[in-house]
C-alpha cells in the first residue's frame, strides 16, 4: 500500500486572527487629514485634523497641542482670529481639506472648507523631540481677493489635493480641486492651479496660472482628485472622472495629469489615461479579451522599488513606480473578479508615453482627426492646433498648450486577483532591503502588509491584522514617520511599524525563520517573536524538526515496519536527500533505519501547501515491550539551509508495538487449481506495513486486511497434498502451525 502524508495548507503556518495592539490616538472626531514632520534634529510630529480642530502629536502619538480651526464665526476659533476682526464670510464648521508642509522654513499649512477655503500657515517650533505650532498666519489679503478672482481661495469643500514644491526659495502650491457649479460660483477656486506663497505669508500671489472645468460642463462633469505627488521634474495628479464629456457621466476612468515642477506654468499640462485590468491566467469563457477592466482608482502611492520587483517590471532598482488600487466602479462592488486590484506604472514609462503623445500631436505628419482633448478645460481642437483655433499661428507652439495623450497606459493586476474579496482603501509602498512591500488598509479596518511580487499564485504576507475592534474603513491618506506608518480609521490614528507589528502570527518555526530579515523574527521555543519579547530563548539560526503524523500507528513486535513520518523541517532541501548520520529515528527503544528517498515518488509540492515525508525501516529490539510508545526524530549536524539549519528533536505519541496472533484458518482444504478464499482470524493482523500469507511458500493474494481478519485467494498447488500455511507480518512469522490440503479439482 502507498500511504501519503496529508497536505498541510500553507495558511496553517500563520494565524491572522492574532491580536496586535499598536500605538493609537483618539482624535475626538473623524480624522479628515494627517501629515507628519521629521526635522533635522530628531524632532518629529504628527498633525491630525478633525472638524474644527487641529491636533499636534509627538512621535509617541501623545497630544502636544491642540488648535481650534472652527467653527468660523465662533470666538473660540484660533485660526479665524489670525485674519483679524470679521466678518469673513458665512459662519460654519471647518472641515480640513488640505494639510501640507511647506518645506521652506518649515511650516504647516492647513486649508479648510470655511472662510472661502483660505489657508493658514503655522511655523513649527521644536521642543525636545516634539514640535509646537506658532500662532497661525492668515494667508488671505482682503484687498486682492474678489468672488470672481480669489488667489487666496484654495480649498474646495468638495475636495482639494495640494503638493508643495520649492522653486528657488519660493514655495509653489500645486492645487487640484473638485468643483461643481455652486462651488465655482461662490468660492471661485480653480480645478488645477499653481500658486506662489508670498514671502511675507500674506497670501498667494495674484495672477496665478490655472485650468478650470468650463462653466457649461460644471453640472455634468465632475473630477475627483485622488492623489498628488512630486517626483523628478514633475508634479502629478491622479483623477477619477467621466471618460467622455458628451457620453454617460457615470462611465468613469482614471487619468494621470502631469505638470512641470520647475516652471510655474500650465502650457505643458498633460493627461494620460491609466488602464488597470485583471487578467486571470486561465480566462473564463465570456471574460473580456485583455482582461476585466478596473477603471476607477481608489488610492495610489508612488515609491522607489526593490530589486526583485524592479526585475519583474523590467526597470532598474530604486526607480520610482506609481502604484494604484483600482475597483470596477464608484461603489467598488463585486464583479466577476476580485474587489480590488493593484497595478504598477513605472514613472519613466509614464513620462515616455506622454512625450510620445506630444510628438504624435505636434510633429509632422500629424494623424488627421487626432484631437487635443481636455474639452472640459478648453475649446475643442485638432492636433497640432491650439485650443479653439483652426490653425497654428507662427508665434505659437503646439507644445505650449494642454494635451490629452491619445493612447492609454495599460497594466494588469500585480496580485493576479489574489486580493479576492478584500476592499483596499489605503495604500503606502515601501522598499525594505530588496523587497517592495505594499501596506494596505481595508474597508473592514485591517492592515495587510504584502510583498509586491508578480510571479506567484499566493500572497506573501508580512502581516494581516485588525487595527482595532471598530472595523471602520481605513482612510485613504497614509503618512510615514521614521520606521512607522500612520493609518487613520474612524476617529483613531494608528502607528504601524513598517517591518510589521510582530511575528506571533507565524505559527511554525520554519515559517518564522523564513520571514523577511527586516521583520526581526526569531523562534522562542514554541512561538515566533521579536527579540524583545523573549530575550532568553530567542534564536534565528535553527529549527527543530516537527512531526505532525506518522503511518502506520502500530507495528509488529517481531519483524520490520516501513514507517512514514510527516511534518516539516526534515530536510530544507527540495530533493529531500539526507546526509549520512544526520537523522535518527527511534520508536520506543528501537531504532528506525532511514531509507533512501525513492526518486520516482518525488512530486512537486506547491508552496501553497507544504509537507515533508521521511521513511525508515523499524526493526524492534529484542528488549522492546509490547504496548504504546513514542516516535522520536532527532536531527543533528545538518548543513544549513537558506534561512536556518534543522537541529533538534520532535516526539509524537501514538505508536504501538503489537504481537499478531493467528487463531483460526478456514477452510483448511481447497482445489489444487487454487482460488480458494481463505479466512485467517486472529488479533493485530493489520499491524505494520507488510504482511504475507504463504501456502507452501507461495503468496496467497490478499483481498482484504483488517485487525482481526485477513482474506486471501490460494495459489494453485503442485500436487494433491497437505502443505504448510504460515502468516508473516513485517517479514517475521506469526507463531502457530497450520496446514492447507490441496484436493483434486
Amino acid at each position: 500500500e502507498d500511504w501519503q502524508c496529508p497536505r498541510t495548507p500553507y495558511a496553517a503556518s500563520r494565524d491572522f486572527d492574532v491580536k496586535y495592539v499598536v500605538p493609537s490616538f483618539s482624535a475626538g472626531g473623524l480624522v479628515q487629514a494627517m501629515v507628519t514632520y521629521e526635522g533635522d534634529r530628531n524632532e518629529s510630529a504628527v498633525f491630525v485634523a478633525i472638524r474644527n480642530r487641529l491636533h499636534v502629536l509627538g512621535p509617541d502619538l501623545k497630544s502636544v497641542q491642540s488648535l481650534a480651526t472652527g467653527p468660523a464665526g465662533d470666538p473660540g476659533c484660533q485660526t479665524c482670529a489670525a485674519c483679524g476682526p470679521g466678518p469673513h464670510g458665512p459662519p460654519g464648521d471647518t472641515d480640513t481639506k488640505v494639510l501640507v508642509l511647506d518645506p521652506a522654513l518649515p511650516a504647516l499649512v492647513s486649508c479648510g472648507s470655511s472662510l472661502q477655503g483660505r489657508c493658514f500657515l503655522h511655523d513649527l517650533e521644536p521642543q525636545g523631540t516634539a514640535v509646537h505650532l506658532a500662532a497661525p498666519a492668515c494667508l488671505f489679503s482682503a484687498h486682492h481677493n474678489r468672488p470672481d478672482d480669489c488667489p487666496d481661495c484654495v480649498a474646495s469643500p468638495l475636495g482639494t489635493r495640494v503638493t508643495v514644491v520649492e522653486q528657488g526659495q519660493a514655495s509653489y502650491f500645486y492645487v487640484a480641486s473638485s468643483l461643481d457649479a455652486a462651488v465655482a460660483a461662490s468660492f471661485s477656486p480653480r480645478s488645477v492651479s499653481i500658486r506662489r506663497l508670498k514671502a511675507d505669508a500674506s497670501g498667494f500671489a495674484p495672477g496665478f496660472v490655472a485650468l478650470s472645468v468650463l462653466p457649461k460642463h460644471l453640472v455634468s462633469y465632475s473630477i475627483e482628485y485622488v492623489h498628488s505627488f512630486h517626483t523628478g521634474a514633475f508634479v502629478y495628479f491622479l483623477t477619477v472622472q467621466p471618460a467622455s464629456v458628451t457620453d454617460d457621466p457615470s462611465a468613469l476612468h482614471t487619468r494621470l495629469a502631469r505638470l512641470s515642477a520647475t516652471e510655474p506654468e500650465l502650457g505643458d499640462y498633460r493627461e494620460l489615461v491609466l488602464d488597470c485590468r485583471f487578467a486571470p491566467k486561465r480566462r473564463r469563457r465570456g471574460a473580456p479579451e485583455g482582461g476585466q477592466p478596473y477603471p476607477v482608482l481608489r488610492v495610489a502611492h508612488s515609491a522607489p522599488v526593490g530589486a526583485q520587483l524592479a526585475t519583474e517590471l523590467s526597470i532598474a532598482e530604486g526607480q520610482e513606480v506609481l502604484f494604484g488600487v483600482f475597483v470596477t466602479g464608484k461603489d467598488g462592488g463585486p464583479g466577476v473578479g476580485p474587489n480590488s486590484v493593484v497595478c504598477a506604472f513605472p514613472i519613466d514609462l509614464l513620462d515616455t508615453l506622454i512625450d510620445e503623445g506630444v510628438e504624435r500631436c505636434c510633429e509632422s505628419p500629424v494623424h488627421p482627426g487626432l484631437r487635443r482633448g481636455l474639452d472640459f478645460f478648453q475649446s475643442p481642437s485638432f492636433c497640432p492646433n491650439p485650443p479653439g483655433l483652426e490653425a497654428l499661428s507662427p508665434n505659437t507652439s503646439c507644445r505650449h498648450f494642454p494635451l490629452l495623450v491619445s493612447s492609454s497606459f495599460s497594466r494588469v493586476d500585480l496580485f493576479n486577483g489574489l486580493l479576492g474579496p478584500v476592499q483596499v482603501t489605503a495604500l503606502y509602498v515601501t522598499r525594505l532591503d530588496n523587497v517592495t512591500v505594499a501596506h494596505m488598509g481595508t474597508m473592514d479596518g485591517r492592515i495587510l502588509q504584502v510583498e509586491l511580487v508578480r510571479s506567484l499564485n499566493y500572497l506573501l504576507y508580512v502581516s494581516n491584522f485588525s487595527l482595532g475592534d471598530s472595523g471602520q474603513p481605513v482612510q485613504r491618506d497614509v503618512s510615514r514617520l521614521g520606521d512607522h506608518l500612520l493609518f487613520a480609521s474612524g476617529d483613531q490614528v494608528f502607528q504601524v511599524p513598517i517591518q510589521g507589528p510582530g511575528c506571533r502570527h507565524f505559527l511554525t518555526c520554519g515559517r518564522c525563520l523564513r520571514a523577511w530579515h527586516f521583520m526581526g523574527c526569531g523562534w522562542c521555543g514554541n512561538m515566533c517573536g521579536q527579540q524583545k519579547e523573549c530575550p532568553g530563548s530567542w534564536q534565528q539560526d535553527h529549527c527543530p524538526p516537527k512531526l505532525t503524523e506518522f503511518h502506520p500507528h502500530s507495528g509488529p513486535l517481531r519483524g520490520s515496519t516501513r514507517l512514514t513520518l510527516c511534518g516539516s523541517n526534515f530536510y530544507l532541501h527540495p530533493s529531500g536527500l539526507v546526509p549520512e548520520g544526520t537523522h535518527q529515528v527511534t520508536v520506543g527503544q528501537s531504532p528506525c533505519r532511514p531509507l533512501p528517498k525513492d526518486s520516482s515518488k518525488l512530486r512537486p509540492v506547491p508552496r501553497k501547501d507544504f509537507v515533508e515525508e521521511f521513511e525508515c525501516e523499524l526493526e524492534p529490539l529484542g528488549t522492546q515491550a509490547v504496548g504504546p510508545t513514542n516516535v522520536s526524530l532527532t536531527v543533528t549536524n545538518m548543513p544549513p539551509g537558506k534561512h536556518f539549519r534543522v537541529d533538534g528533536t520532535s516526539v509524537l505519541r501514538g505508536f504501538s508495538f503489537m504481537e499478531p496472533v493467528l487463531i483460526a484458518v478456514q477452510p483448511l482444504f481447497g482445489p489444487r487449481a487454487g482460488g480458494t478464499c481463505l479466512t485467517l482470524e486472529g488479533q493485530s493482523l493489520s499491524v505494520g506495513t507488510s504482511r504475507a500469507v504463504l501456502v507452501n511458500g507461495t503468496e496467497c493474494l490478499l483481498a482484504r486486511v483488517s485487525e482481526g481478519q485477513l482474506l486471501c485467494a490460494t495459489p494453485p498447488g503442485a500436487t494433491v497434498a497437505s502443505v504448510p500455511l504460515s502468516l508473516q507480518v513485517g517479514g517475521a512469522q506469526v507463531p502457530g502451525s497450520w496446514t492447507f490440503q490441496y484436493r483434486e479439482d
Partner: antibody, heavy 120, light 107 residues
Framework: EVQLQQSGPELVKPGASMKISCKAS????????MNWVKQSHGKKLEWIGL????????IYNQKFKGKATLTVDKSSSTAYMELLSLTSEDSAVYYC?????????????WGQGASVTVSS | DILLTQSPAILSVSPGERVSFSCRAS??????IHWYQQRTNGSPRLLIK???ESISGIPSRFSGSGSGTDFTLSINSVESEDIADYYC?????????FGAGTKLEVK
Amino acid sequence: EVQLQQSGPELVKPGASMKISCKASGYSFTGYTMNWVKQSHGKKLEWIGLINPYNGGTIYNQKFKGKATLTVDKSSSTAYMELLSLTSEDSAVYYCARWLRRGGYAMDYWGQGASVTVSS
Amino acid sequence: DILLTQSPAILSVSPGERVSFSCRASQSIGTSIHWYQQRTNGSPRLLIKFASESISGIPSRFSGSGSGTDFTLSINSVESEDIADYYCQQSDSWPLTFGAGTKLEVK
C-alpha cells in the same frame, strides 16, 4: 522696550572670517524671524537672509549663500551671522532686523548696525 | 529677483511742503511694499507697511498708497527732522529686495 543690540565695529584681514552678534530683548525672541541686511558705502541696502529662531530654518539670498551663515542661540536670545572668506567687497555696515513673517508685518525693529572693515 | 526702482534719487523741498516718493516694482506685488526712513548714521526705521498701513509712533504726516507695481510714500508737511534717505522694500518674493533710495533735502 524692544531692542536689538549688535556687536561693535570690526577691522579684519582679507581671507579671514568673523561673526557678528545681535542680542534681542524686550520681546519673545522665537516669535519673530531675524533678518540680516548689508548696507555698503554706496548706501545700497541688500537683504542677506533670515533665520527662524523658532526652528533654525533659514532662507538666504542666493547672492550671499556661502558668504554668510546664520545661526541662533535661543538660550541667550542672540542671533549670529558669520561672514566667511572676507574681501574688501564685504566692507559694509550689517544690520539685524526682526520680522514677523505674517501678513501684516514688516521689519519693525533694527539693530544699530555693525561696521565691518576688511583691510590688510 | 524683483527690482524696485525709486525716483527721484534726490528730492529737495521747503519745510511745510508736501512731498511724494515713488517706488516702481518690476512685477506686480499686490501691496507687499514697506517704507523705511534712515537718518544720517542711523538705522532704518519702519514708516509704512503693506503700502498704506500706518505704524504706531510714526507721525501722521506720513502716508502711503498704491498696489500692483506703483507705490507712493507721501509726507504732507515736511519738517526738518524728515531729512533722511527713504527706502522701499518688497516682501512679496524671495529674495527680499530694497529700492536704491531717495534722499530728501530741505531747502
